[in-house]
């Protein structure tokens, strides 16, 4: 569950995402079929850059209340197509 | 944390080619796609290839048609397929998943 999923990601809170919670996260999401927002919520609030891994037009669905904790050091590792889409979103989530 | 190594450098005379490897720890650390960068002397950080968590792929126009960026999840690696190269490609590149960074492999590009 999300529940149980929150839980183990919590207890790795402030560490960089080790390869065991990478396998972790990978099987729920695959899992779950789809990339729902209750988990990209959750997903963002201990890992924000697991939004690099998405692709723009995966990242063209996130609604910009999922990205307003993400800070820019954040997203070192997206390219700019996902900055593009990513920057108008951030803009609103700020504004709101 | 992910550790993440690049191989495939080298020296190469313009208009040849060069395979370059990424290869991660952790079992399904490049299902979450990877990308490669690139710093030549004196320059800036720029973006060179993607491939998404999704498997869709994206380059930058200054490498689109002559680089081609794949990944084999059994191996846990990326590849980045360099053709028709030019002087101007001579850079450290750098692959990156997942908020890790490689510590980069020299490609030298000469006339």
């Known amino acids: 569950s999300l529940e149980t999923l929150k839980a183990l990601l919590e207890v790795n809170k402030g560490h960089e995402m080790s390869p065991q919670v990478a396998t972790l996260i990978d099987r729920f999401v695959k899992g779950r079929g789809q990339l729902d927002k209750d988990t990209l919520d959750t997903l963002t609030a201990f890992y924000p850059g697991y939004l690099c891994s998405l692709s723009p037009e995966e990242l063209s669905s996130v609604p910009p209340s999922s990205i307003w904790a993400v800070r820019p050091q954040d997203l070192d590792t997206c390219d700019p197509r996902q900055l593009d889409v990513l920057y108008p979103k951030a803009r609103l989530a700020f504004q709101n | 944390q992910l550790q993440l190594v690049e191989s495939g450098g080298g020296l190469v005379q313009a208009g040849g080619s060069l395979r370059l490897s990424c290869t991660a720890s952790?079992?399904?650390?490049?299902?979450?796609?990877a990308k490669w960068f690139r710093r030549a002397p004196g320059k800036e950080r720029e973006w060179v290839a993607s491939v998404y968590r999704d498997g869709t792929t994206g380059y930058d126009d200054s490498v689109k048609g002559r680089f081609t960026i794949s990944r084999d999840l059994a191996k846990n690696t990326v590849y980045l397929q360099m053709n028709s190269l030019r002087l101007e490609d001579t850079a450290v590149y750098y692959c990156t998943a997942l908020n890790s960074w490689g510590q980069g492999t020299q490609v030298t590009v000469s006339s």
């Open positions: 952790g079992s399904t650390s490049m299902s979450y796609g």
